[in-house]
Interface confidence: low
Amino acid sequence: IVLRPSRVHNSEENTMRALTLKDILNGTFSYKTFFPNWISGQEYLHQSADNNIVLYNIETGQSYTILSNRTMKSVNASNYGLSPDRQFVYLESDYSKLWRYSYTATYYIYDLSNGEFVRGNELPRPIQYLCWSPVGSKLAYVYQNNIYLKQRPGDPPFQITFNGRENKIFNGIPDWVYEEEMLATKYALWWSPNGKFLAYAEFNDTDIPVIAYSYYGDEQYPRTINIPYPKAGAKNPVVRIFIIDTTYPAYVGPQEVPVPAMIASSDYYFSWLTWVTDERVCLQWLKRVQNVSVLSICDFREDWQTWDCPKTQEHIEESRTGWAGGFFVSTPVFSYDAISYYKIFSDKDGYKHIHYIKDTVENAIQITSGKWEAINIFRVTQDSLFYSSNEFEEYPGRRNIYRISIGSYPPSKKCVTCHLRKERCQYYTASFSDYAKYYALVCYGPGIPISTLHDGRTDQEIKILEENKELENALKNIQLPKEEIKKLEVDEITLWYKMILPPQFDRSKKYPLLIQVYGGPCSQSVRSVFAVNWISYLASKEGMVIALVDGRGTAFQGDKLLYAVYRKLGVYEVEDQITAVRKFIEMGFIDEKRIAIWGWSYGGYVSSLALASGTGLFKCGIAVAPVSSWEYYASVYTERFMGLPTKDDNLEHYKNSTVMARAEYFRNVDYLLIHGTADDNVHFQNSAQIAKALVNAQVDFQAMWYSDQNHGLSGLSTNHLYTHMTHFLKQCFSLSD
C-alpha cells in the first residue's frame, strides 16, 4: 500500500483543503525532473531557471555560463545544442509541431570563440531536423525532405539526396507511420561514432493511400490535410538504408545497405540502426507479419567502398506465441569487442531478460532470469552493465536500477536504487555520463519526484539535483487521496490494480467507482509513480473511488499475459476490466449502481466495448478519441497484434471486434463520445462511424468534438474536455455541483 502524505490531527484538518479542478487544469501541483545534458565523463549542461546555459564540472565543483540568456533571447531560442568540439552552439527557434515527435524550426549557429552568430551560408528555414556530428562540428540537416551536410557551420552545404518530395519521398526523416509506430523519433539518420559515416533511411510513400481531413482554421474554405497513412492491410512505405562517407561525400556517394534475403522475400520494415564502430553498423529488420526480426551486422569494405552484411552475422529473433519483442523489438547494446552484444528478449519461460550474444542467438548466455522482466539496458562499460527491472519485491509496476559486474567472472548483481529512499522512490530511470563515470537517477514516485547525482564507481549520492521542495510545501495543506497497489488472482491470471481512495475513506461506506482504462498491448497503467491529476481531484473533492487495472495484454509480467491478446484484440482486455469490477464490488465499499468507465485512445476502445458488454455493470462511460475498428488504424501497430484483415488471415476478428457491431448494447448506458476533428493518429472517422451506428440503431448518446484538435486535445481544449467530463460524471453519479 502506498500512503500519500496525510495529516490526522484535527487541528490541522481545518486548514486542509481538497483538490479542485482548477488546481489540475492550472498544473498547480506539477513536478520537475533534472536530466543532465552530458557532454563528457564529468561535465554536463543545464538550462538555469533564468535561461542561461550553464556548464557544470562535477569533479572541480565549478560551473560557468557558456551561453547567456541574452543571446538566447536575441533569436527567441527555446532549445540549444553544443557542438562536441565546444566551438559552436545551434539555437533553435520558431518551433512548429508536426506529429508526435516531429517539428520544424529555424536554426542559428553561434560561434563561442568570437561571441557572434555565424554569418554567410546561413541555414535555410524551416529545417525538419538538424544535428552535430559526434566529434568536431560537422552538421547534418534535413530540409524539404532532403539531407544536407556541412563540414563546418560557415561552409556551403553539400546536398546528399535530391529525390525528396513532400508526402512522397522522405530522406533522413520518417514518414507518419514510421515516426509513430516504428522509430518513435523525428529523425532517420545516424552518425557513426567518430563522424566518418552518416547512415540514413529513405522512405518511399508514393503508393500509400492518403488520409484526408478538413482543417477549419479561420479561412472561408477549410484546408485539407493529406497524410500518406497505411491502414491495416494497405500498401506500406518502401524503405532503403544508405550510408555516405562524410569526409569525401562526393567520392562514391551514398551506398545502399543490403537487406537480408529472408527479410527481402516479402513486405518488411526497417526497425532500427545501431553503429558499433566507424566501420561496423548493425541494422534491424522485421517482416510485415511481425513475428520474425533479423539483426544484421554489416562491415565496410574499403576496397569496394561498400557495406557487406555476411549471413554469418545475421541473428534471427522469432516469436512462436505472439509478435517479436515487446512494444518494439529491443535494440542491441554492443560490448567493447565490437561484435558481441547484450539484448533483451524472451527466455524459455516467457519472461523478457537480458541475454549476451557472442556468436549465435541459440548460444546466447542468459544474464538475468526470474519471473519478472528486465526492461531497459542503460549502459555497458568494460566492467558493468546497468539495467532496470521490476524484480524488487515482485511489484511489476516498479522500476529499479541494477548493476551487474561483467568485468569479474562470474558476474555479481547489485540493486543500486532499491533501498535509497524506499518509501518515496520505487520507480526510477537513469542518465549516464561517458563511460558511466557519473549518473543521474530520476525517481518518479510514488512519493514526490526527486533527481540525484551519483558516482558511477561507488554509487554514492553526490548531490540532489531537484527535490521539488516548492511542490512539497504546496501539498502540505492539500487532502490528497490515498493510493494502494494490490493484486487480484482470478483463474490463474494476476490482475494488478491501483486504487485511488478519497482522503476520509471509510470501508463501511459506499462510494461511486470510476475505472480508468488504457489496456493496449504492452502498456502498463499500474505504476508506482507520483501524480496529481484529474482522477486525484475526483477522489479528493468528489469522493469517488478510481481504479486502474492491468489485464491481459499488458506488459512486464511475462509473455503469457502479454501475448494472450494476440490476434484477438478487444476481448480479454475488456473481460479483465469487468472481472476486476466484480471483485471490487465484492470488497463491499462500492455503490453498484454508480460505476463508470473512461479511457482515451486504446482506452476509449476498451471503455466503449466494456459499456457495450451487456453486463449491466456500468451506468455510464466516456470514450475519448477511441479506435472503433482495427481496419481504421495504422498497419504497423494493428498488424503487429492482429495479423492482416484478409479472409485467409484474420478478417473475421477484425469485423467482430468493432465498436459499431455492438451499437445496440449502448441502449442501457449513458455514453459520452469525444474526438478531435484533426486527429492524425486515431482518425475522427473512428468516432464518426460509432456515431453513425448509434444513430442507425436509434440509441441516444452524448458527444463532443474539438475542432482542429489532434489526438492530444491540448491547450484550451484540455480545460473544456475535463470540465465537460467532470459534469458528465457528476450527473451520472448524482453528485451535486
Epitope: A364, I365, Q366, S369, G370, S412
Partner: nanobody, 123 residues
Framework: QVQLQESGGGLVQAGDSLRLSCAAS????????MGWFRQVPGKQRELVAA???????YYADSLKGRFTISRDNAKNTMYLQMNSLKLEDTAVYYC?????????????????WGQGTQVTVSS
Amino acid sequence: QVQLQESGGGLVQAGDSLRLSCAASGRTFSSYVMGWFRQVPGKQRELVAAITSGLSTYYADSLKGRFTISRDNAKNTMYLQMNSLKLEDTAVYYCAAREGGGIWTSSTQYDYWGQGTQVTVSS
C-alpha cells in the same frame, strides 16, 4: 521442480582423485545452470565450479586447474572430477541448479539444492 542427489564423496588421501556425481530428476535438466558448492563448518557456501546449458564453465580461482566440471544431458547428470586433492578441499559438497542463464557465485541465486556429500582429505 528438480530433485538433486549427490554421490561419490568419501575419505581420500591428499594427492588422490575423486569424482562427484549429481543426478537430477524432474524438469528439463539441460536448460539449467548447474553448480558445485562447498561448505566447511562456520563458513559460507562457496561456488567451486559451474556449467551453463551452453557448456560455459566457471572455476573458483583457488582451484588452479585441479577440478573439472562436466555434464551429460542425456543422463541428467553433472560431474566434478577432483584431482590432486588437498587438506583444504575437505568440505560438504553440494550440487545446485539455477533456472535461466548466467553463472552466479552467490548461493542465493540457485533455486534447487541436493543434500550434500562429505569429502574428507587426510594426510
